[in-house]
Interface confidence: low
């Protein structure tokens, strides 16, 4: 099978880290500096990604794998393979077009990234608020008075977060 495949594509035998530099040349040449091929059978090597500016190098480029970037302190990755760096905000804030803004009342954000989310509505689950929410933390729901029987747990974890949505400005 392998021999047949090579007859159809003379370059199929070139391993990762090399390229087949001519149509019928079945000799594999190594990728030049600052380039890579992560799979076999490549006719060219790809240029290594350069982590510049707000990006910093998390993993150096090799002949068989691209460089990987992350973001400098104060920024976080967005997109596949950290294609963008977005500014961090403090907990209790979200990033808007005008910069970091505090979460509106009734919403929270417990991370340095993402948007403010509404507090959990304990009453939807027949619970009562045990601990009030803040800009940085969701409310903690407790059992309804009817549930307060001997042996019953006094605290339950917060309900799963609702679908994220932008809080009113």
């Amino acid at each position: 099978f392998e021999r047949t495949r090579s007859l159809q594509d003379p370059c199929s035998n070139c391993p990762a880290g090399t390229f087949c530099d001519n149509n019928r040349n079945q000799i594999c040449s190594p990728c030049p500096p600052n380039s890579f091929s992560s799979a076999g059978g490549q006719r060219t090597c790809d240029i290594c990604r350069q982590c510049k500016g707000v990006f910093r190098t998390r993993k150096e480029c090799s002949s068989t794998s691209n460089a990987e970037c992350d973001c400098t302190p104060g920024f976080h990755c967005l997109g596949a393979g950290c294609s963008m760096c977005e500014q961090d905000c403090k907990q209790g804030q979200e990033l808007t077009k005008k910069g970091c803004k505090d979460c509106c009342f009734g919403t929270f954000n417990d991370q340095k990234r993402g948007i403010c989310r509404p507090w959990t509505n304990c009453s939807l689950d027949g619970k009562s608020v045990l601990v009030n929410g803040t800009k940085e933390r969701d409310v903690v729901c407790g059992p309804s008075p009817a549930d307060l029987s001997p042996g019953a747990s006094s605290v339950t974890p917060p309900a799963p977060a609702r679908e994220p949505g932008h809080s009113p400005q």
């Epitope: 090579s6 391993p15 149509n23 040349n25």
Partner: antibody, heavy 116, light 107 residues
């Protein structure tokens, strides 16, 4: 079956030229590149270069640039090696070899002797 | 160019012996190594390609192994017809280069 048949031995004087032929059979000639290898008396194998049998484009090793020419006649499935301005140090057996992953089929070799 | 160093250069052995020839490359050549057998007055014959794959019709007593910079050709039980010179060759970069050869002689 795959066969590469080379032309016979040659005795040449210094300064002359020689043309070695390599006729292929048993496969589609233009599907595989053809490589040339030199072996001086009592010595090892030395890669000279190769020719793209589809396009006719030759590639020469550094030591074989200038006096050595690879060519083809695809109508008769034949590759050629021409050496001009022969020198005594060109005395060697010259092999053609089909290339698929490696030099998988070789001609029987052509002895070129350069002597005054 | 990539240098290939074969060892030993000469090897005396008897029929039935297990014979091992090594080939060291001056830099990483992945698995892009072939082994050839050449008898006096004859053209080389391909034995092994891609470091370990036997060419069509090559007896199973011949085997190849290795990757990176170190490769081995092993003849598990030497036969009378195996007395010859063996060459390794890399095809990882242009120009492809050959080792200096290992001559296997009858002890």
């Amino acid at each position: 079956q795959v066969q590469l048949v080379q032309s016979g031995s040659e005795l040449k004087k210094p300064g002359a030229s020689v043309k070695v032929s390599c006729k292929a059979s048993g496969y589609t000639f233009t599907d595989y590149s053809m490589h040339w290898v030199r072996q001086a008396p009592g010595q090892g194998l030395e890669w000279m270069g190769w020719i793209n049998t589809e396009t006719g484009e030759p590639t020469y090793a550094d030591d074989f640039k200038g006096r050595f020419v690879f060519s083809l006649d695809t109508s008769v499935s034949t590759a050629y090696l021409q050496i001009s301005s022969l020198k005594a140090e060109d005395t060697a057996v010259y092999y053609c070899a089909r290339y698929d992953y490696a030099m998988d089929y070789w001609g029987q070799g052509t002895l070129v002797t350069v002597s005054s | 160019d990539i240098q290939l160093t074969q060892s030993p250069s000469f090897l005396s052995a008897s029929v039935g012996d297990r014979v091992t020839i090594t080939c060291k490359a001056s830099q990483d050549v992945s698995s892009a190594v072939a082994w050839y057998q050449q008898k006096p007055g004859k053209a080389p014959k391909l034995l092994i390609y891609w470091a370990s794959i036997r060419h069509t019709g090559v007896p199973s007593r011949f085997s190849g192994s290795g990757s990176g910079t170190e490769f081995t050709l092993t003849i598990s039980s030497l036969q009378p017809e195996d007395f010859a010179t063996y060459y390794c060759q890399q095809r990882y970069t242009t120009p492809p280069t050959f080792g200096g050869g290992t001559k296997v002689e009858i002890k």
